[in-house]
Amino acid sequence: QAGPLPKPTLWAEPGSVISWGNSVTIWCQGTLEAREYRLDKEESPAPWDRQNPLEPKNKARFSIPSMTEDYAGRYRCYYRSPVGWSQPSDPLELVMTGAYSKPTLSALPSPLVTSGKSVTLLCQSRSPMDTFLLIKERAAHPLLHLRSEHGAQQHQAEFPMSPVTSVHGGTYRCFSSHGFSHYLLSHPSDPLELIVSGSLEDPRPSPTRSVSTAAGPEDQPLMPTGSVPHSGLRRHWE
């Protein structure tokens, strides 16, 4: 009795983070013995799609011509060979950006910061959100991922950095998201250039507690100024 069929490999081109309206192709690669490929989407009736293999039969293509909210989510694929179905692939998380208007990203007290001092990056969204992501250009993964502890909706999240070193210099953007689907992100914020001067090669710092703030009423500034902060967001390093 042969062992279980090896699991296929699942990936997306041009990538797994796709802007609304753009096309994306999901590939599932199995073995040359594959007769059929199946793609399942979490929380969707299975199978989400089936495809015959492309020659030489070791992979199949699943095309999404125009990315929308419905396609965002977590996928796995399988293939069927003469001896049965394979193990599921590792999951592919397909994320859509452009689901919400872009947040604004600020550096306080200034984007020009001296090494050894503190700076806070502030990401503010137009509508209340419960997840904020801060990314640095050319970094492989989000630097920081703030999520509300209790589903509380916030208009902003703070990303403190202290003490700042040369490592922190660079271009940042942030995204916001709702808890009901973390596969749907806002447009990216405009870029923020953080410039660190007088750089000393300090050890890599650990961030301090993150803070979120609720929006004020309509007769107050549209983004809160001087609201009492409360730590409703939990920090995740990725």
């Epitope: 208007s101 604004t104 600020s106 306080l108 137009r126 749907l184 007769d219 983004m223 100024t225």
Partner: antibody
């Protein structure tokens, strides 16, 4: 590309109501606020209010409260603004506009509403 | 409500020359939470809807020529067109988004001298 396409011109009698539509395309409709702005002939811009298609949340300028109603049909990506008890000073071009961050990055082409007896 | 006042009401500038439009708010538009000014500028040509030029007082919208520049802070703001082109003939509006109701300036009509 983002587009906001509004319904055609309307001529109404004083006291009547008008319902203007704004059909959105080219972006994720639910996640962006849509506002309405009034521009009387040869005059400036006046904010009327907004609707958030995701949950139907609305907020109106106090000046229009009681006379304006904004609604959304997510199935057709369309928002509506109804203005009741029309008077001559409601004669204007009415624009829908997509909010970016309280400012407006895309505008409809405008709908002319003429109130005349 | 925050009152936005533009000056001048109309302006005639020669092609290639600098045009400057001012906008004054009845209260500060500078947020202490993020040190940003909640002010936008729009251009409106006859028979067309307004077009966003500048937001956060000085950030140019994508696709807007770099001859358009916004400056100022607090209550006093300026839109500058560094070298006027024929296609810049329009009415320009400032808008505050610091608090509801959102309000606009009365507009400045820019013409060719």
């Amino acid at each position: 590309q983002v587009q906001l396409v509004q319904s055609g011109a309307e001529v109404k009698k004083p006291g009547a109501s008008v319902k203007v539509s704004c059909k959105a395309s080219g972006y994720s409709f639910s996640g962006f606020y849509i506002d309405w702005v009034k521009q009387p002939p040869g005059k400036g811009l006046e904010w009327i209010g907004y609707i958030f298609p995701s949950n139907g949340e609305t907020s109106y300028n106090q000046k229009f409260k009681g006379r304006v109603t904004m609604t959304v049909d997510k199935s057709t990506s369309t928002v509506y603004m109804e203005l009741s008890s029309l008077r001559s000073e409601d004669t204007a071009v009415y624009y829908c506009a997509r909010q970016a961050f309280y400012y407006f990055d895309y505008w409809g082409q405008g709908t002319t509403v003429t109130v005349s007896s | 409500d925050i009152v936005m006042t533009q000056s001048p009401d109309s302006l005639a500038v020669s092609l290639g020359e600098r045009a400057t439009i001012n906008c004054k708010s009845s209260q500060s538009l500078l947020s202490s939470s993020n040190q940003k000014n909640y002010l936008a500028w729009y251009q409106q040509k006859p028979g067309q809807p307004p077009k966003l030029l500048i937001y956060w007082a000085s950030t140019r919208e994508s696709g807007v020529p770099d001859r358009f520049a916004g400056s100022g802070s607090g209550t006093d703001f300026t839109l500058t067109i560094s070298s006027l082109q024929a296609e810049d003939v329009a009415v320009y509006y400032c808008q505050q988004y610091y608090s509801y109701p959102l309000t606009f300036g009365q507009g400045t009509k820019l013409e060719i001298k």
